[in-house]
Interface confidence: low
Amino acid sequence: QLSLPSILPNENEKVVQLNSSFSLRCFGESEVSWQYPMSEEESSDVEIRNEENNSGLFVTVLEVSSASAAHTGLYTCYYNHTQTEENELEGRHIYIYVPDPDVAFVPLGMTDYLVIVEDDDSAIIPCRTTDPETPVTLHNSEGVVPASYDSRQGFNGTFTVGPYICEATVKGKKFQTIPFNVYALKATSELDLEMEALKTVYKSGETIVVTCAVFNNEVVDLQWTYPGEVKGKGITMLEEIKVPSIKLVYTLTVPEATVKDSGDYECAARQATREVKEMKKVTISVHEKGFIEIKPTFSQLEAVNLHEVKHFVVEVRAYPPPRISWLKNNLTLIENLTEITTDVEKIQEIRYRSKLKLIRAKEEDSGHYTIVAQNEDAVKSYTFELLTQVPSSILDLVDDHHGSTGGQTVRCTAEGTPLPDIEWMICKDIKKCNNETSWTILANNVSNIITEIHSRDRSTVEGRVTFAKVEETIAVRCLAKNLLGAENREL
């Protein structure tokens, strides 16, 4: 952090004799510059030069060869790199007075005679004297106006609208300024800016409309920045609404939009005081033609448990707005005949959410479900298979004697979704079959026993076990199981 530059002479203010020369030296730890009262056109007799010295500091000298009333004002020495357009200069100051008996007031530019007052704020009427000792009075149409005076700034106070004149007497001679005109304007310390784009997505040929509204301000410039600006594509309009309060509504219209008009649309408002700025932007996208995107939140094979309540949610992005419908096994879903409902809600401008709701899932709800979204430019669909999961149950367990061969087959029919697995167990000691430890799993690797399994349809399975020869009484158990449960039966 650099310390502030220093100025010689080391004074806050200095009175310089008319037509005499004076110089100001600025010392800094980095390169320094001067800001002084006159504009570049008026400053032909101001010379600024750099000076070498042995202190290791940077030295810049401001020299005035012949001081005049116009040289009265604030001289600021600042570091070059600290200057920004936004902020007041940070540096060291000295105020120079050059009293001139013929020029009581420091000459001003025409715009300085326009004093903008925002609401009931205080303002400065900038009549500055060339001599700090000169008494000054402020007058309007009603007479002398009481206001505090500072010869460096002028009169500070709360002024009503109208013309004001500063009056001074120097050595018995009376001087008057030309009138300062005070204007009252509706303005706020912060810009209340609102942007509205009823749509942010368009397709070729449509008209883009964006509005920006500024509230409680009359003193605003609003600039639009948008992709088609370089081609002058936009039409801007301004509407001033005064009731119930002041509101400036700026509208940008871009007709016959193309894909190239996609991008950021920005409105930047700035107050005429040049200090208060506010900006808002919106991203607009223009598509060659309408589109649809379907994004399901589930897979193409879904399962629901029997009697369960389940929702299937599909996100749809589409423009123009789509019509959304559901099919089951390629037929339109008739909701009032089933405990299935569908709905569509708009989430955002081009985002929709459609839900398929199963109230109490039944076996017959299984099938292929399709969501179809369509608009004038596109059609998209998504199909998934729904399985209603049913716990396994044994429908039938029977045996079949092979007659003289002494062989025997046992058939076990079971159902469930997913399709159940069938396992066989045997108990060779009938008296002990009540004890679970007496049961053993029948292995397929036993040579004289064959086990098979067949599915009859989507949910029914048949298991068979064939004994080549049964020499003693045994008990056989069929165990059918799937994800949701198991059931067994014995023979």
Partner: antibody, heavy 121, light 107 residues
Framework: DVQLQESGPGLVKPSQSLSLTCTVT?????????WNWIRQFPGNKLEWVGY???????SYNPSLKSRISITRDTSKNQFFLQLNSVTTEDTATYYC??????????????WGAGTTVTVSS | DIQMNQSPSSLSASLGDTITITCHAS??????LTWYQQKPGNIPKLLIY???NLHTGVPSRFSGSGSGTGFTLTISSLQPEDIATYYC?????????FGGGTKLEIK
């Protein structure tokens, strides 16, 4: 006090490009305002050509948009007009002008002296 | 584009007279109208903005009125220095457009 000064060739051949420069003194073109080109045809009709704002954004008259480009050189405090494929219809006095916006309304408050451009073979 | 029609295209009046120039917009431009004065061989100068507001330094004999599509510029007590062409310009929407001008001469 801000001053604007146009410069450029007084004579341009048809189908060639017209290039003009506006040099601004007394005010930085990046500080504020919109910096415009306006032309006045021999019959005295005025036409707004386009602008470049303090931020560098531009806006053009749609009747010229396929042929026009307004750019700037902030280091020289200048802004430029380039008009391509000129015809005799582009013969005019070209003004650069500053657009002010006090009191919630914009208008051209400072104008350059103008430079006359003749399109002729 | 918004068309701006000025009438009359030329006008001859005596010193001290009051004259009126009208400007008609092809669509509603609210109060977004500016008047400029261009003296012979000179550049256009801002006269009146927002239909009725006098620019700083413009004599009070100049006045503007109107809103919507119809606007007038009135010069009372005509002075020799008022010899000029007067233009209206709309600021309602891009592109900004000017009227054809009214040339004022002194009889």
């Amino acid at each position: 006090d801000v001053q604007l000064q146009e410069s450029g060739p007084g004579l341009v051949k048809p189908s060639q490009s017209l290039s003009l420069t506006c040099t601004v003194t007394g005010y930085s073109i990046t500080s504020d305002y919109a910096w415009n080109w306006i032309r006045q045809f021999p019959g005295n009709k005025l036409e707004w050509v386009g602008y470049i704002s303090y931020s560098g954004s531009t806006s053009y008259n749609p009747s010229l948009k396929s042929r026009i480009s307004i750019t700037r050189d902030t280091s020289k405090n200048q802004f430029f007009l380039q008009l391509n494929s000129v015809t005799t219809e582009d013969t005019a006095t070209y003004y650069c002008a500053r657009r002010d916006y006090r009191y919630g309304y914009w208008y051209f408050d400072v104008w350059g002296a103008g430079t006359t451009v003749t399109v002729s073979s | 584009d918004i068309q701006m029609n000025q009438s009359p295209s030329s006008l001859s009046a005596s010193l001290g007279d009051t004259i009126t120039i009208t400007c008609h917009a092809s669509q509603n431009i609210h109060v977004w109208l500016t008047w400029y004065q261009q003296k012979p061989g000179n550049i256009p100068k801002l006269l009146i903005y927002k239909a009725s507001n006098l620019h700083t330094g413009v004599p009070s004999r100049f006045s503007g009125s109107g809103s919507g599509t119809g606007f007038t510029l009135t010069i009372s007590s005509l002075q020799p220095e008022d010899i000029a062409t007067y233009y209206c310009q709309q600021g309602q929407s891009y592109p900004w457009t000017f009227g054809g001008g009214t040339k004022l001469e002194i009889k």
